[in-house]
């Protein structure tokens, strides 16, 4: 007769590290010792005629257990396969590139350590909740990859890795483990350099706006801009409008920066850089300064007029050029009445990098001279009709400007000068027109002949 040795439970599934109660029983009418053959930690819990119960503890891996017993001069055995399921110990998405160019492929790499049975373990790579790849976990550790074409929409998207241990066929459910998400940053940086608008020349201690613009940048708000004049970083105001970035700064040249310089604009995004450079000459243009040896000269005195400017500047004073650039221009004159109010013009020319820059300056000479009454403007004999309106047109000149009064001889009667007045016969007579200033007096005799009007 064939006797059986039953092992229960048959082919159990349990969680790693768990315990299992195993019963071995036989219908063989024998009181023989039943042995449980296993490398697992076991303890005989109880036994009786034809049966033995064992407790297996700390079951960490798949195992085949066997019971054996002597029966009627032979040995009979029974077995059961233990399947252990273990959740992955580590599910980790490898770090993503710090910045990923749009339109280029990148690789998602997920590492899964432990987890069994492997045949029931699936690794899923996700963007948000969208499945990008689903693959079985094979080696230990399992590495699952997926190639993704980076798009603008991926900027800021979380990527993660999920494991699914499907123990549903065994009635134990679906065990899910998810890695910490990793955020992708994508970018577009055009190959073209930025547009840099800057002056060709910049005078020391003056300021000028500098603009740097780059189009087709994504995300423009993440870009970093560096604007500099030589090694002097400029404080830029950066503005984004859509995919366009504009940086504006004010460049102010210092005296120690004189000469050929560069304005640099760097736009950095995603660890890449685009650069524009423009040449700029920092120049110093002093003057021109026009000086008079005497700003207020006496008639007949010698006056020196000089014009000077900075180094390398060619000056021309009233059409007379200086001997050489950087040299002053001078002229001398004897001050005359006609020189009073005369303006002396100085033009300065500086060549900067092939361009000629011009500046002008002037000064006015004052000549002090005594009073005069111009006979041409002051008629010495006047014939006017009685009871008519007239103007005594007399003009005096002099520096300082004289006071002009016309007084009738032998009386204190004064006629207004340059103002219309009503003429009558009493105005008939000789007048002393006197121009007076601190520099003297000048008198001209004017005769007024008033013709009596006809009576009706």
């Amino acid at each position: 007769q064939e006797f059986l040795l039953r092992v229960e439970p048959q082919n159990p599934v349990l969680s790693a590290g768990g315990s299992l109660f195993v019963n071995c029983s036989t219908d063989c009418p024998s009181s023989e010792k039943i042995a449980l053959e296993t490398s697992l930690s076991k303890e005989l819990v109880a036994s009786g005629m034809g049966w033995a119960a064992f407790n297996l503890s700390n079951v960490t891996g798949n195992s085949r257990i066997l019971c054996s017993v002597y029966c009627n001069g032979s040995q009979i055995t029974g077995s059961s396969n233990i399947t252990v399921y273990r959740l992955p110990e580590r599910v980790e998405l490898a770090p993503l590139p710090p910045w990923q160019p749009v339109g280029q492929n990148f690789t998602l790499r997920c590492q899964v350590e432990d987890g069994s049975p492997r045949t029931s373990l699936t690794v899923v790579l996700l963007r948000w909740e969208e499945e990008l790849s689903r693959q079985p976990a094979v080696e230990e550790p399992a590495e699952v990859t997926a190639t993704v074409l980076a798009s603008r929409d991926d900027h800021g998207a979380p990527f993660s890795c999920r494991t699914e241990l499907d123990m549903q066929p065994q009635g134990l459910g679906l065990f899910v483990n998810t890695s910490a998400p990793r955020q992708l940053r994508t970018f577009v940086l055009p190959v073209t350099p930025p547009r840099l608008v800057a002056p060709r020349f910049l005078e020391v201690e003056t300021s000028w706006p500098v603009d740097c613009t780059l189009d087709g940048l994504f995300p423009a708000s993440e870009a970093q801009v560096y604007l500099a004049l030589g090694d002097q970083m400029l404080n830029a105001t950066v503005m984004n409008h859509g995919d366009t970035l504009t940086a504006t700064a004010t460049a102010t040249a210092r005296a120690d920066q004189e000469g050929a310089r560069e304005i640099v604009c760097n736009v950095t995004l995603g660890g890449e850089r685009r650069e524009a450079r423009e040449n700029l000459t920092v120049f110093s243009f002093l003057g021109p300064i026009v000086n008079l040896s005497e700003p207020t000269a006496h008639e007949g005195s010698t006056v020196t007029v000089s014009c000077m400017a900075g180094a390398r500047v060619q000056v021309t004073l009233d059409g007379v050029p200086a001997a050489a650039p950087g040299q002053p221009a001078q002229l001398q004159l004897n001050a005359t009445e006609s020189d009073d109010g005369r303006s002396f013009f100085c033009s300065a020319t500086l060549e900067v990098d092939g361009e000629f820059l011009h500046r002008n300056s002037s000064v006015q000479l004052r000549v002090l001279y005594g009073p005069k009454i111009d006979r041409a403007t002051c008629p010495q004999h006047l014939k006017w009709k009685d009871k008519t309106r007239h103007v005594l047109q007399c003009q005096a000149r002099g520096n300082p400007y004289p006071e002009l009064r016309c007084l009738k001889e032998g009386s204190s009667r004064e006629v207004p000068v340059g103002i219309p007045f009503f003429v009558n016969v009493t105005h008939n007579g000789t007048y002393q027109c006197q121009a007076s200033s601190s520099r003297g007096k000048y008198t001209l005799v004017v005769v007024m002949d008033i013709e009596a009007g006809s009576s009706h």
Partner: antibody
Framework: QVQLQQSGAELADPGASVKMSCKAS????????MHWVKQRPGQGLEWIGY????????EYNQRFQDKATLTADKSSSTAYMQLSSLTSEDSAVYYC????????????WGQGTSVTVSS | QIVLTQSPALMSASPGEKVTMTCSAS?????IYWYQQKPRSSPKPWIY???NLASGVPARFSGSGSGASYSLTISIMEAEDAATYYC?????????FGAGTKLELK
């Protein structure tokens, strides 16, 4: 009749290994579990472990886990025990003994193999 | 592990005398086995399942006991009984032997 014939005496250097045999005859080798027992001169009996020749399953006394390795060859009905990393403490007589079942205990014993460890 | 303690370790008896030796277990066992060993010989099975005599063992030997306390008795000592007797259990791994009782002839 049942017989267990053990291999001859062994003289070994410290650190060496020895492998002794126990040839069974007179019964079906795969049915019965084969045990091994150590006896130092003038001392008692100490159980080393057993092998089930039918399944090659072995179970050891923890004290001998890293010292003894039990194997069996069904085709020649021979059980083997290898002792490794020998020291003077391993000098003893080693017996193989068949477990005849609960009703008999260790019912047949080999004549013993003497192992002497000496430099 | 279950420790078996045999007493006395050494005893002597005259022919015709009654001899009793004991074997106590550190925890309860279902049954024990006794083996006889003479100098330069392999051990021989003597008593199995606590009280059953192995084939060829004289009827003057008997075994008894239960739980943790067991004994082997020789009703009338004979010269051929001088030997060392070992008790053994296999309730759990490891299988263990007692240290033995050496019985000498007076």
């Amino acid at each position: 009749q049942v017989q267990l014939q053990q291999s001859g005496a062994e003289l070994a250097d410290p650190g060496a290994s020895v492998k002794m045999s126990c040839k069974a005859s007179g019964y079906t080798f795969t049915v019965y579990w084969m045990h091994w027992v150590k006896q130092r001169p003038g001392q008692g009996l100490e159980w080393i472990g057993y092998i089930n020749p039918n399944t090659d399953y072995t179970e050891y006394n923890q004290r001998f886990q890293d010292k003894a390795t039990l194997t069996a060859d069904k085709s020649s009905s021979t059980a083997y025990m290898q002792l490794s990393s020998l020291t003077s403490e391993d000098s003893a007589v080693y017996y193989c003994a068949r477990w005849g079942g609960n009703s008999y205990g260790l019912d047949y014993w080999g004549q013993g193999t003497s192992v002497t460890v000496s430099s | 592990q279950i420790v078996l303690t045999q007493s006395p370790a050494l005893m002597s008896a005259s022919p015709g005398e009654k001899v009793t030796m004991t074997c106590s277990a550190s925890s309860s066992v279902s049954y024990i086995y006794w083996y006889q060993q003479k100098p330069r010989s392999s051990p021989k099975p003597w008593i199995y399942l606590t009280s059953n005599l192995a084939s060829g063992v004289p009827a003057r030997f008997s075994g008894s006991g239960s739980g943790a306390s067991y004994s082997l008795t020789i009703s009338i000592m004979e010269a051929e009984d001088a030997a060392t007797y070992y008790c053994q259990q296999w309730k759990s791994i490891p299988l263990t032997f007692g240290a033995g009782t050496k019985l000498e002839l007076k």
